[in-house]
């Protein structure tokens, strides 16, 4: 696959991953109460996210409440907010770096410098995926740990929400996309011999006797 194709595929994956990360960040479904038995009239599901919590009645009515005070939030929510938003912003920066280093743009003159810019964009996307992975896994660990913690009553037991799965898929796309961008850049910088695939060898010298080697003749 050509370096330009790798770049385009990598960039598309990163953009989809970035969108997924924004979605995961905003959704109030990082942790959800267990699936409900809809035979119970009073049944309700609680969703909790980084910015708000929602209560969904069995009737389908949903009521959401944005968290009032930042200081009242748990450490893990505050850290998850900071890291996820940082990852989203970093992906935004990585987009411009990648576009500047792309072969189809003229922001940077073609050559090793351009390829290095493209490589930087790929590395930034890789780092962005890792950065987003930290709060997702940390949060998931807390949810699972509390689910099995006997001190936590069943009313406070949550399960992994859709936002975490979307987030994990997004980080996978960002990291795969980042790898492809790095590969595309590496094809341009690290393998200069590929630019000149045809090799020419010097003509054979005559033998000591002045005659050409017999094997050259049929």
């Amino acid at each position: 696959m050509g370096s330009a194709a790798l770049e385009i595929l990598g960039l598309v994956l990163c953009l989809v991953g970035w969108g997924g990360l924004i979605l995961a960040c905003g959704l109030p479904m990082w942790q959800v109460t267990a699936f409900l038995d809809h035979n119970i009239v009073t049944a309700q599901t609680t969703w909790k996210g980084l910015w708000m919590s929602c209560v969904v009645q069995s009737t389908g009515h949903m009521q959401c409440k944005v968290y009032d005070s930042v200081l009242a939030l748990s450490t893990e929510v505050q850290a998850a907010r900071a890291l996820t938003v940082s990852a989203v912003l970093l992906a935004f920066v990585a987009l411009f770096v990648t576009l500047a280093g792309a072969q189809c743009t003229t922001c940077v003159a073609p050559g090793p410098a351009k390829a290095r810019v493209a490589l930087t964009g790929g590395v930034l996307y890789l780092f962005c995926g890792l950065l987003a992975l930290v709060p997702l896994c940390w949060f998931a660990n807390i949810v699972v740990r509390e689910f099995y913690d006997p001190s936590v009553p069943v009313s406070q037991k949550y399960e992994l929400g859709a936002a975490l799965y979307i987030g994990w898929a997004a980080t996978a796309l960002l990291m795969v996309g980042g790898c492809l961008l790095c590969c595309g850049a590496w094809v341009c910088t690290g393998r200069p011999d590929l630019s000149f695939p045809v090799k020419y060898s010097a003509p054979r010298r005559p033998t000591a006797t002045g005659d050409y080697d017999k094997k050259n003749y049929v």
């Epitope: 699936f35 119970i40 006997p150 001190s151 009553p153 069943v154 009313s155």
Partner: antibody, heavy 118, light 112 residues
Amino acid sequence: QVTLKESGPGILQPSHTLSLTCSFSGFSLNTYGVGVNWIRQPSGKGLEWLASIWWHGKTYINPSLKNRLTVSKDPSNNQAFLEVTNVDPADTATYYCAHARAQLLDYWGQGVMVTVSS
Amino acid sequence: DIVMTQTPSSQAVSAGEKVTMSCKSSQSLLYSGDQKNYLAWYQQKPGQSPKLLIYLTSTRESGVPDRFIGSGSGTDFTLTISSVQAEDLADYYCQQHYSYPLTFGSGTKLEI
């Protein structure tokens, strides 16, 4: 064999701080899943849950008494503690500590009678 | 907070009779994760500490006679003593072990 025993002042004056100790044996507050609860019962009345303290240090306190209650533990000496600040005659009751199995109270102490009176 | 309401407040029965007492919660105690109802019953004999009888609505604590039967679901629960014995003279309290703060019913006094 699990046993718990509460100890305290018996009688104290209004606005003072009530300090109770729960000494237990047969289990350790360092062991995974173990907790100690505090419950009180005014004479001839029902049971009121006050607080829980767990092996990992997490505590739960009845919101109606949140500003006045403190729970702590000393696992090395097999003890749990309850402090109630600014007591008044309404706090007169028998105070129990109980071993927790999740949110169940499966072993109870004999209780200590506390009277708040001037 | 979940409010627990017990009825009747007292009940007089003769030995050998069947007795039932009711406990209602202000919200469902059914946890959909395991389809279990988080309600317990305690017995407190005169001058003694409470003793856990039944948890998860119908599971008897070890050593509890099988004449004690718990039933119910959602918000309505019942404790039945199939054949009352003289030693069953006590106060009976229901408790939700579904959420904090843990709350008890006001109790049913069983008089023989």
